[in-house]
């Protein structure tokens, strides 16, 4: 399901409990979608040994996965509450080529990964109602992504499993840092 | 053995600095969240700050601009510098994990603990 | 976000029902800890997510809350659970001067 229980539209409150505001819906739909990645990486982690790896000992490759940095507003030090929802945005965004890549690559999870990837859009749209400056935001490109996601299907075994590993610990961080900086807002 | 070890505590003069250190050993500490947490003489528990799988970082309010957390991968080791010290920094600093690093803060690797002494 | 834990201190027998509570300044969903510090050691989470037993702690343990209050229970109190014990949110930690709730300290009756 792309959204967490109870948190489809067209759900009717109960009685007792208040309908979520746009912040908690967010919140509530960040922690569903890590708690999807936490079991895609069992399953990648159960297969290889890459989940004790140090990162450094990961870093070299190719793939252009979204990161926060200072610069974008959303730590602590600095931080920017416009500048920080434009960053997370665009991220997820970005993302969606890799995620798009993840499908398929489950044997036990497929359902998972298909969760996360349709949970990523419901956020993304939810972010986009919170967003004022939505000029800023930079759509990626189909035409490059559809090049990227057929040069990493090409890779071979071993590299797609550390593509697969890469992705869903960049994801889960991106998400993490997004999600400590919106519990700021 | 997986282990958290602070060093570097010690006496130091009020406006003065240190720097802790925390060594891990039996993993990897850039793929966790690393706090520090303090305690001083028959006091509570006191959180200090935090970096995070990403080198983000967090401090409690008090902290900020006196206090700063790194990390030196390659040594596998936590830092952190504390500047302009005073006699209410006595205390004893601990190091800890987060061993899930899901996205809510919790500890269950702590080091032994280090004594800073601020005196003059 | 402030902690605020309560009682400060209590005095419980052995096979006791201890209850000791966190209270939140604001929601924190179920991100609370608790953990146990005995006098010259390291603390030792005993639960996470309000209600989840870490590794290796008896289960007379047990956590409940959401939201803004919580409770830590020993159901029966043994020897060995004369400690401090301290909660801990896990929901923040911008803005805020301590994650930790002050203390409460269970003594021998």
């Known amino acids: 399901a792309p959204v967490p229980p109870g948190e489809d539209s067209k759900d009717v409150a109960a009685p007792h409990r208040q309908p979520l505001t746009s912040s908690e819906r967010i919140d509530k739909q960040i922690r569903y979608i890590l708690d999807g990645i936490s079991a895609l990486r069992k399953e990648t982690c159960n297969k290889s040994n890459m989940c004790e790896s140090s990162k450094e000992a990961l870093a070299e490759n190719n793939l252009n996965l979204p990161k926060m940095a200072e610069k974008d507003g959303c730590f602590q030090s600095g931080f920017n509450e416009e500048t920080c929802l434009v960053k997370i945005i665009t991220g997820l965004l970005e993302f969606e080529v890799y995620l798009e890549y993840l499908q398929n690559r489950f044997e036990s999870s497929e359902e998972q990964a298909r969760a996360v990837q349709m949970s990523t859009k419901v956020l993304i749209q939810f972010l986009q109602k919170k967003a004022k400056n939505l000029d800023a935001i930079t759509t990626p490109d189909p035409t490059t992504n559809a090049s990227l996601l057929t040069k990493l299907q090409a890779q071979n075994q071993w590299l797609q499993d550390m593509t697969t590993h890469l992705i869903l610990r960049s994801f889960k961080e991106f998400l993490q840092s997004s999600l400590r900086a919106l519990r700021q807002m | 053995e997986v282990q958290l070890v602070e060093s570097g505590g010690g006496l130091v003069q009020p406006g003065g600095s240190l720097r802790l250190s925390c060594a891990a050993s039996g993993f990897s500490l850039s793929n966790y969240y690393v706090t520090w947490v303090r305690q001083a003489p028959g006091k509570g528990l006191e959180w200090v700050g935090i970096i995070y799988g990403s080198d983000e970082t967090a401090y409690a309010t008090w902290a900020i601009g006196r206090f700063t957390i790194s990390r030196d991968n390659s040594k596998n080791t936590l830092y952190l510098q504390m500047n302009s010290l005073r006699a209410e920094d006595t205390a004893v600093y601990y190091c800890?994990?987060?061993?899930?690093?899901?996205?809510?803060?919790?500890?269950?690797?702590w080091g032994q603990g280090t004594l800073v002494t601020v005196s003059s | 976000i402030q902690m605020t834990q309560s009682p400060s201190s209590l005095s419980a027998s052995v096979g006791d029902r201890v209850t000791i509570t966190c209270q939140a300044s604001?929601?924190?969903?179920?991100?609370l800890s608790w953990y146990q510090q005995k006098p010259g050691k390291a603390p030792k989470l005993l639960i996470y997510?309000?209600?989840t037993l870490a590794s290796g702690v008896p289960s007379r343990f047990s956590g409940s809350g959401s939201g803004t209050d919580f409770t830590l229970t020993i159901s029966s109190l043994q020897p060995d659970d004369f400690a401090t014990y301290y909660c801990q949110q896990g929901y923040s930690l911008r803005n805020i001067d301590n994650a930790f709730g002050g203390g409460t300290k269970v003594e021998i009756k």
């Open positions: 604001q929601s924190i969903n179920n991100e």
């Open positions: 800890a994990r987060d061993d899930s690093s899901d996205w809510d803060a919790k500890f269950n690797l």
């Open positions: 997510r309000a209600s």
